[in-house]
Amino acid sequence: GHSLFTCEPITVPRCMKMAYNMTFFPNLMGHYDQSIAAVEMEHFLPLANLECSPNIETFLCKAFVPTCIEQIHVVPPCRKLCEKVYSDCKKLIDTFGIRWPEELECDRLQYCDETVPVTFDPHTEFLG
């Protein structure tokens, strides 16, 4: 089963080359494990494959397979990264008819330094 509040090694191939190697679930979209996240992420992969933004792969991984630090914190992508990617990829998103998840709407994310990300506590985010 899925053990709550523990970091786990990344197993999603696309995200194994990221600068971080541990993740935590559920993610922002409420996907409960990496296999579900990988399937959902599949819909967005043409954006990465067609290189609409130099930051697209980083953003998708940080959103779907978030960084995990200090055991109980999930690190969502920063708002500036989201805005850059969404702006770069908007035309491609429309062309593919990709539904951008409301949880990833940029104005829901916080401004932060990508090197020192803002964290959120899954107790409050997911357990109310």
Epitope: P46, N49, K91, T95
Partner: antibody
Framework: QVQLVQSGAEVKKPGASVKVSCKAS????????MHWVRQAPGQGLEWMGG????????IYAQKFQGRVTMTRDTSTSTVYMELSSLRSEDTAVYYC???????????WGQGTLVTVSS | DIQMTQSPSSLSASVGDRVTITCRAS??????LNWYQQKPGKAPKLLIY???SLQSGVPSRFSGSGSGTDFTLTISSLQPEDFATYYC?????????FGGGTKVEIK
């Protein structure tokens, strides 16, 4: 209605360059990506690359990298494809194609035959 | 690069026949698969996009199905104007690649 009208046939010598134009009408030019596809005589379709007319950002097939340049003139809603260092294997019909839903090519130019011969 | 393999490369059929053309991708491409029809001396024409969506103005006898690696184009009742070459194309990843084509000839 959407129309893509290409320039006429060209005959070129090996080593030369060719520039094919494609004039778009019937839609907002900057709203859709534009790509180029070629077809050698009696052969299948081969993707060369494409770009976003809004910002000119290009993406080329590795095979043509360094030999192909795609540009646009937004004032006349025209896209251009220039292929340099031509060789006989480049003899083909060159098509411009607009990208539609699902990243399909929903409208095509009539094609431009480029013959490379010494 | 993703290889697209079409089969058969050619087929003979009669007006009214049900015709099925298959396209296989060398790796999963989800549903990012498009089908085109091309007649001699003419530009290709889009029939189906995103594996199963019928392009506006295309007769409903054309249909597409499949996802992942295996896709099918079906013409439910072949008409005289359908004799042409059909190509599949993946839009999942660059380089965008086409199948080798299937020529549908009159029996």
């Amino acid at each position: 209605q959407v129309q893509l009208v290409q320039s006429g046939a060209e005959v070129k010598k090996p080593g030369a360059s060719v520039k094919v134009s494609c004039k778009a009408s019937g839609y907002t030019f900057t709203n859709n990506f534009m790509h180029w596809v070629r077809q050698a005589p009696g052969q299948g379709l081969e993707w060369m690359g494409g770009f976003d007319p809004e910002d000119g950002e290009t993406i080329y097939a590795q095979k043509f990298q360094g030999r192909v340049t795609m540009t646009r003139d937004t004032s006349t809603s025209t896209v251009y494809m220039e292929l340099s260092s031509l060789r006989s294997e480049d003899t083909a019909v060159y098509y411009c194609a607009r990208v539609g839903r699902g990243y399909s090519f929903d409208y095509w130019g009539q094609g431009t035959l480029v013959t490379v011969s010494s | 690069d993703i290889q697209m393999t079409q089969s058969p490369s050619s087929l003979s059929a009669s007006v009214g026949d049900r015709v099925t053309i298959t396209c296989r991708a060398s790796q999963s491409i989800s549903s990012y698969l498009n089908w085109y029809q091309q007649k001699p001396g003419k530009a290709p024409k889009l029939l189906i996009y995103a594996a199963s969506s019928l392009q506006s103005g295309v007769p409903s006898r054309f249909s597409g199905s499949g996802s992942g690696t295996d896709f099918t184009l079906t013409i439910s009742s072949l008409q005289p104007e359908d004799f042409a070459t059909y190509y599949c194309q993946q839009s999942y990843s660059t380089p965008l690649t086409f199948g080798g084509g299937t020529k549908v000839e009159i029996k």
